[in-house]
Amino acid sequence: ELCDDDPPKITHATFKAVAYKEGTMLNCECKRGFRRIKSGSPYMLCTGNSSHSSWDNQCQCTSSAARNTTKQVTPQPEEQKERKTTEMQSQMQLADQVSLPGHCREPPPWENEATERIYHFVVGQTVYYQCVQGYRALHRGPAESVCKMTHGKTRWTQPQLICTGETEPSQFPGEEEPQASPDGLPESETSR
């Protein structure tokens, strides 16, 4: 069952998942100047059975000359959101190690993919938070959020994390300075 909303936003922090539960959707988003091809699903889906899961549908982006019909209040320069290729590659290598029943690994990047991945998570999904570069984590508990179903409604638990200004970035569970990650699993790509 899909979570009704997105994981909580923590100031100066991003989140990511170890692996994605079956039923998770990843929107086929393209970078500026490109758009999703007209034939093909608007999203990839983590699907399969208890022994093997994989992403159904493939995202494809094509060049676009569409005129802009959105009034943008402040420009969002591409460089602000640019994802580092080397960072992506190392994250993909980590993701390759993940093999959880009923879960999918981080899907590989597609050509002209947008800089931010938009996921629709399902109940039971856990995401892990880390402070962005230049901020340090102060923990009051686990830096994670779980989508739970309560009385027919979905909600995300509140991660116990505060990010304060400092030079050293904190680490995701499974990286150089592990922080209470279940089974010490490596992480996949940032989804915020």
Partner: antibody, heavy 114, light 107 residues
Framework: QIQLQQSGAELVRPGTSVKMSCKAA????????IGWVKQRPGHGLEWIGD????????NYNEKFKGKATLTADTSSSTADMQLSSLTSEDSAIYYC???????WGQGTLVTVSA | DIVMTQSQKFMSTSVGDRVSVTCKAS??????VAWYQQKPGQSPKALIY???YRYSGVPDRFTGSGSGTDFTLTISNVQSEDLAEYFC?????????FGGGTKLEIK
């Protein structure tokens, strides 16, 4: 809580235009496509088109090209649809929808009458 | 355009029964099919995405199945509140298209 709030009913003259709005709340407006769907009694549901507020990209059902114009304003998290050269065939309920059709507005009833 | 055909416009059932609403696509749409429920005077409500995955809050008596061209929405243990019209939709390619709808009547 995710909500799509649509503007109120419209009674309009044939040959004129009408603009309806869909205000999104409870999620990041620029991340998700907003679609528009037409419903007429006996005609089921018809997909008109969609718009990506983050990039301004639009897709239209060929049938509605020249009839519908989709726009979005990121400052107010509002998507608009304008229908032009109205005829009785345009009398219908129009829904906006988002997050891969998971959420629907309450609909805007448009009545075209002389 | 891909045509989605719901051959039964009306279906009659009783509380506690099991009923299956079918939908046929004019060409292969993979599993890119959704099901919606619309009660009189209300907006459509999303029930199923990707042919078989339930949205949150949808009772587990609603089950979707199928792939390719043939799809089914099954309601087991029908309740009086299931009185509604049910639509299928393909989003495999533009333009997205809906089935004509199947009205479920409770005897």
């Amino acid at each position: 809580q995710i909500q799509l709030q649509q503007s109120g009913a419209e009674l309009v003259r044939p040959g004129t235009s009408v603009k309806m709005s869909c205000k999104a709340a409870g999620y990041t407006f620029t991340n998700y496509w907003i679609g528009w769907v037409k419903q007429r009694p006996g005609h089921g549901l018809e997909w008109i088109g969609d718009i990506h507020p983050g990039g301004g990209y639009t897709n239209y059902n060929e049938k509605f090209k020249g009839k519908a114009t989709l726009t979005a304003d990121t400052s107010s998290s509002t998507a608009d649809m304008q229908l032009s050269s109205l005829t009785s065939e345009d009398s219908a309920i129009y829904y906006c929808t988002s997050r891969n059709f998971a959420y629907w507005g309450q609909g805007t009833l448009v009545t075209v009458s002389a | 355009d891909i045509v989605m055909t719901q051959s039964q416009k009306f279906m009659s059932t009783s509380v506690g029964d099991r009923v299956s609403v079918t939908c046929k696509a004019s060409q292969n749409v993979g599993i890119n099919v959704a099901w919606y429920q619309q009660k009189p005077g209300q907006s459509p409500k999303a029930l199923i995405y990707s042919a078989s995955y339930r949205y949150s809050g949808v009772p587990d008596r609603f089950t979707g199945s199928g792939s390719g061209t043939d799809f089914t929405l099954t309601i087991s243990n029908v309740q009086s509140e299931d009185l509604a019209e049910y639509f299928c939709q393909q989003y495999n390619s533009y333009p997205y298209t809906f089935g004509g709808g199947t009205k479920l009547e409770i005897k």
